[in-house]
Amino acid sequence: PSPPPEKKELRKVAHLTGKSNSRSMPLEWEDTYGIVLLSGVKYKKGGLVINETGLYFVYSKVYFRGQSCNNLPLSHKVYMRNSKYPQDLVMMEGKMMSYCTTGQMWARSSYLGAVFNLTSADHLYVNVSELSLVNFEESQTFFGLYKL
Amino acid sequence: PSPPPEKKELRKVAHLTGKSNSRSMPLEWEDTYGIVLLSGVKYKKGGLVINETGLYFVYSKVYFRGQSCNNLPLSHKVYMRNSKYPQDLVMMEGKMMSYCTTGQMWARSSYLGAVFNLTSADHLYVNVSELSLVNFEESQTFFGLYKL
Amino acid sequence: PSPPPEKKELRKVAHLTGKSNSRSMPLEWEDTYGIVLLSGVKYKKGGLVINETGLYFVYSKVYFRGQSCNNLPLSHKVYMRNSKYPQDLVMMEGKMMSYCTTGQMWARSSYLGAVFNLTSADHLYVNVSELSLVNFEESQTFFGLYKL
């Protein structure tokens, strides 16, 4: 008898885009409309929830902009939370200080991306220092991952 | 009889580098010499042409520089075009404003990278706002993707 | 008789983090503690040593910061060395000039990431122009790759 057809495993992947009704940290994300992807990973209250242990490439971009530069320090973090551990683990972080000319309209992006060994039930989030300076266009601010 | 040898599928991948004879948008790319990769994907008039539907990680870096900073707004976009759709879709974008000190020699990069579900016949391109401010060194300005 | 169990090949992957006792170029990396990954790739004197020819996604982020901006040109390079070739090959590079306001405390990141065809025995390194301006926090400065 011929072997059973190979079961094509669904690729674990996510690409979430900026959601302008984020009011506090962590950032919240669009998980349904537009160029969004969510397969084999869950989205819950701003976080991507891992359901299979393994190696993942995780990335995020945040687009900061303002009308009148006052050089507030900017930070952009991808961090991990797991009920087994008491503290959040910062996986990747970008910081900016003294990045624009005082009083001028300004714009700048922060990009992060790297490989991590994630465990089932890990929750991944994105945090920024100045929510009011984030622009949430889907092409400009996003958060994603895929299992290697 | 033993089963036929497994057919190792060619990885769909591209890494194209800056081409200084770009005169208009979209940017054109070096697809032959140097650290270039092009396998299972076609290059046509500045665009990467997808020939198999699936999930792809797409990335681009552009290196902007100038001699007497005027702070012209800079933008760097990766966008998609498909004959089925009337309009280009901006997949990823970076913008910079007020990024250098007036009159000074300056240099800055923009990096973009994320996962997308692409369809056979999609054409991917890179656009910049100020072509004259782009430096096309192969290590500095590039455009690539690979199928997950 | 049933076929032998499939041998699950170990994924070739590395994620190394900043090591503050770097004294000269190339940068040295933490390869043991924290959120480090090293599997199927060797680490030797600042370099990742490839032991299987193939396609790899290679990335690095460097976090530069200073107490009093004097706009020293910053560069961040990922380069490759192989005993067969006389010269280092710069794979990816980021440069920054005129990026902060003179005299101010400042901070800025450079991110690089792309796909390359690497050969067994290739050594990959990271170089920066101003070692004293690099901050080596594990979440901020890192170097990694994975085989596609």
């Epitope: 000319t101 | 005027n70 007036t102 | -």
Partner: antibody, heavy 119, light 111 residues
Framework: QVQLVQSGAEVKKPGASVKVSCKGS????????IHWVRQAPGQGLEWMGV????????SYNQKFKGRVTMTVDKSTSTVYMELSSLRSEDTAVYYC????????????WGQGTLVTVSS | EIVMTQSPATLSVSPGERATLSCKAS??????????MNWYQQKPGQPPRLLIY???NLESGIPARFSGSGSGTEFTLTISSLQSEDFAVYYC?????????FGQGTKLEIK
Amino acid sequence: QVQLVQSGAEVKKPGASVKVSCKGSGYTFTDYTIHWVRQAPGQGLEWMGVISTYQGDASYNQKFKGRVTMTVDKSTSTVYMELSSLRSEDTAVYYCARFPDWDYAMDYWGQGTLVTVSS
Amino acid sequence: EIVMTQSPATLSVSPGERATLSCKASQSVDYDGDSYMNWYQQKPGQPPRLLIYAASNLESGIPARFSGSGSGTEFTLTISSLQSEDFAVYYCQQSRELPYTFGQGTKLEIK
């Protein structure tokens, strides 16, 4: 064709201020910074500062800091250079010149404005 | 600031002959493979005119008898065969960093 046209000659008393204009035409005005260079009679060239025609902010030679102000009026494609607390050694021809950000040098210059400071 | 020193202050050459003008910078004006050194010509009552940019590149519309060379701190402007219209003052200028600085000029006069 590209032109930078400067305002006419001025005679000023010591302690006064002078405002010289430079109007660009024949090119996209906001794509180029404008630099100011002066030349005292029989002397060499001295760089005074530069203004971003797009953003409107300026960088000045420390030697003139506090005395020079450069401004831009995008609506008329005109840049202004004001020098205050004039002294006799400020007597010079003042030039504006445009600088393409993507290039290496000041490629077009105004015709110059003679400012004479005399009591 | 970078100090530019030109020599000689005055150069007397006959028409048709070759003229070599020198410019030294107090520190290197090179960066990333380029030399940020420019040469200008100025005639009485006129603004300076760009001749050579980035040490050795001829500005469009400038005759090929003008050439520039050098890197780091030492640069040369050469006029291969002097024409009557070439007698003027020549300035070198660095655009490596602000404040931009000029040499004091070399006056090229008819011998």
